[in-house]
């Protein structure tokens, strides 16, 4: 058994472009202990969507269904999606350090955006 | 029905060892995120000691770090706490306890009692 | 490390009335809209018992009379209509990712 699971039900989302998305993410354990954040893209060039320790992220909502009880909801809202916003996101687990070391990834959700 | 047992408390002298165990049955041990808090009448309760669910990860306050090793055999559905260099402030009850999602302790043990005194 | 101040230490209440604990952390406690504030009974020669999770969160099993609520850095449990079998001492728990999680010094609820 998986010591960590970060689980992105939804492979992809579908949004008509003014709308808000939401983006689902839970986290098998609060242990490792360490931040997650959200992610557009893979590898070096992805871009940072929402961190809650640092940074300014005006569309970006955390929405976690704190009655959840065997595991830790981080989800996100993104609101007024524009089709800027098209592609995918990824919910990643980090363990606290200096720097924090990335853990693990959720399978991400491709975000497409129609038109109004 | 969630039981766990400690056991390894006693009388033991300043600057020596004991080694608690906690035998866990009626829930996926191997799933759950495990920990030692104690109590004494004076402080209160205090967090020792939490491992992750498969072993890889622990976490000790400053209080024990670098005396206290927390492991655990998942195959044995059994934890340990090894305590080495006791001191008197070490004297407490031991509970073990059990957490689903490694935020609140979900079920605790009846605890073991250890006493660090010459 | 998280400071956690519990009030009062102690509390006598009238059976069928409300009793209240509150809880306040030196710094907050929240993260991802989740507080990682939790609440435990504990009753004479027994382990602690979990009663709420995250806040606000009843516990499975544990009677609705039990309630929580608060965020950041202060709490409240709620115990309304106190019962006779509800003499116990009643601890806060923060398990923040701030390392070291920590307690509160406890209340001891009694009937008057």
């Known amino acids: 058994e998986e010591e960590l699971q970060v689980i992105q039900p939804e492979k992809s989302v579908s949004v008509a472009a003014g709308d808000s998305a939401t983006l689902n993410c839970t986290v098998s354990s609060l242990i490792p202990v360490g931040p997650i954040q959200w992610f557009r893209g893979a590898g070096p060039g992805r871009e940072l969507i929402y961190n809650l320790k640092e940074g300014h992220f005006p569309r970006v909502t955390p929405v976690s269904d704190p009655t959840k009880r065997n595991n830790m909801d981080f989800s996100i809202r993104i609101s007024n999606i524009t089709p800027a916003d098209a592609g995918t996101y990824y919910c990643v687990k980090f363990r606290k350090g200096s720097p924090d070391v990335e853990l693990k990834s959720g399978a991400g959700t491709e975000l497409s955006v129609r038109a109004k | 029905e969630v039981q766990l047992v400690e056991s390894g408390g006693g009388l033991v002298k300043p600057g020596g060892s004991l080694r608690l165990s906690c035998a866990a049955s009626g829930f996926t041990f191997s799933s759950y995120v495990m920990s030692w808090v104690r109590q004494t009448p004076g402080k209160g309760l205090e967090w020792v000691a939490t491992i992750s669910s498969g072993g890889t990860y622990t976490y000790y306050p400053d209080s024990v770090k670098g005396r206290f090793t927390l492991s655990r055999d998942n195959a044995k559905n059994s934890l340990y706490l090894q305590m080495n260099s006791l001191r008197a402030e070490d004297t407490a009850v031991y509970y073990c306890?059990?957490?689903?999602?490694?935020?609140?302790?979900?079920?605790w043990g009846q605890g073991t009692t250890v006493t660090v005194s010459s | 490390d998280i400071v956690i101040t519990q009030s009062p230490a102690s509390l006598a209440v009238s059976l069928g009335e409300r009793a209240t604990i509150s809880c306040r952390a030196s710094e907050s406690v929240d993260s991802y809209g989740m507080s990682f504030m939790h609440w435990y009974q504990q009753k004479p020669g027994q382990p602690p018992k979990l009663l709420i999770y995250?806040?606000?969160n009843l516990e499975s099993g544990v009677p609705d009379r039990f309630s929580g609520s608060g965020s950041r850095t202060d709490f409240t449990l709620t115990i309304n209509p106190l019962q006779a079998e509800d003499v116990a001492t009643y601890y806060c728990?923060?398990?923040?990712?701030?390392?070291?999680?920590?307690f509160g010094g406890g209340t001891k609820v009694e009937i008057k």
């Open positions: 728990h923060q398990s923040s990712e701030n390392l070291p999680w920590t």
């Open positions: 306890a059990s957490s689903v999602d490694g935020s609140a302790f979900d079920y």
């Open positions: 995250r806040a606000s």
